[in-house]
């Protein structure tokens, strides 16, 4: 699987999940988020050669087509597969509020 366990431990040029830390205050201007200060959102990147974690028959065909026709622009894209939520804490006045934000952390990628 093209997940963090594999991708973060290997120098992989092809489609894989890459580490990306986002600081809420400095990177996004979200000064009001109390905790966490930031988090690893991660992202997907890298080429999708033939049979590289192909998501659908279409992406398999597209990958093969691109392999046999290297000059073609059509090829599968490296995109998030599994995402996890992130829990944040902020204050409304002095009242703490905890929210779970869905699909905030990329855990694995696929070619689609």
């Amino acid at each position: 699987a093209l997940d963090t366990n594999y991708c973060f431990r290997n120098l992989e040029e092809n489609c894989c999940v890459r580490p990306l830390y986002i600081d809420f205050r400095q990177d996004l201007g979200w000064k009001w988020v109390h905790e966490p200060k930031g988090y690893y959102a991660n992202f997907c990147s890298g080429p999708c050669p033939y049979l590289r974690s192909a998501d659908t028959t279409h992406s398999t065909v597209l990958g093969l087509y691109n392999t046999l026709n290297p000059e073609a622009s059509a090829s599968p894209c490296c995109v998030p597969q599994d995402l996890e939520p992130l829990t944040i804490l902020y204050y409304v006045g002095r009242t703490p509020k905890v929210e779970q934000l869905s699909n905030m952390v990329v855990k694995s990628c696929k070619c689609s």
Epitope: W32, G93, K97
Partner: antibody
Amino acid sequence: EVQLVQSGAEVKKPGASVKVSCKTSGYTFITYWMNWVRQAPGAGLDWMGQIFPAWGSTNYNEMFEGRVTLTADTSTSTAYMELSSLRAGDIAVYYCARGYGNYALDAMDYWGQGTLVTVSS
Amino acid sequence: DIVMTQTPPSLSVSPRETASISCRASESVDSYGNSFMHWYLQKPGQSPQLLIYLASNLESGVSDRFSGSGSGTDFTLRISRVEANDTGVYYCQQNNEDPLTFGQGTKLELK
């Protein structure tokens, strides 16, 4: 230039709902809380609630809880306020106002031009 | 809810004089070393505009004739050398407690 442009005046019957829009430009919509404030004729300002457009988190004033719904469309950088079960006491000018940015509840540094909502049978 | 009480309700001032508006909160609006109190001016037929942020910080583009002071429960907005353009209704606002609340307003007129 930061701009908040609201939809036009509305006339509604008692019991009906009204939805006011607030189209923003000149800043990153998902970076700031959007507040809604109402002002009855000749009266002061009442905070209704707020929304964080990035994921739709909302905080409402209990005075309006259950009747007001705040939403946001990030694709058009537009915020919406819907008020249901309208009554004569809801006749007011409704403002959208951008939060200052340091806190969830905060001062408001940019305001829309206001939308007059009239309730009449 | 924190109740904000402004005095006086209305004020008539001669040009070039100094006007003072008071705002008293029903409980302290201080937290983490800040006073969560702000001041706005609503000119006739217009939307409110932010003048003072966090009790004493002048908002960008606002004349330095406006100044704010105070902490805890008692705050003051001062307008020096009053001009015709300063007429309107002034509001204080707190955001230390949910819900955010405003004062009832002080109407400033020129003599």
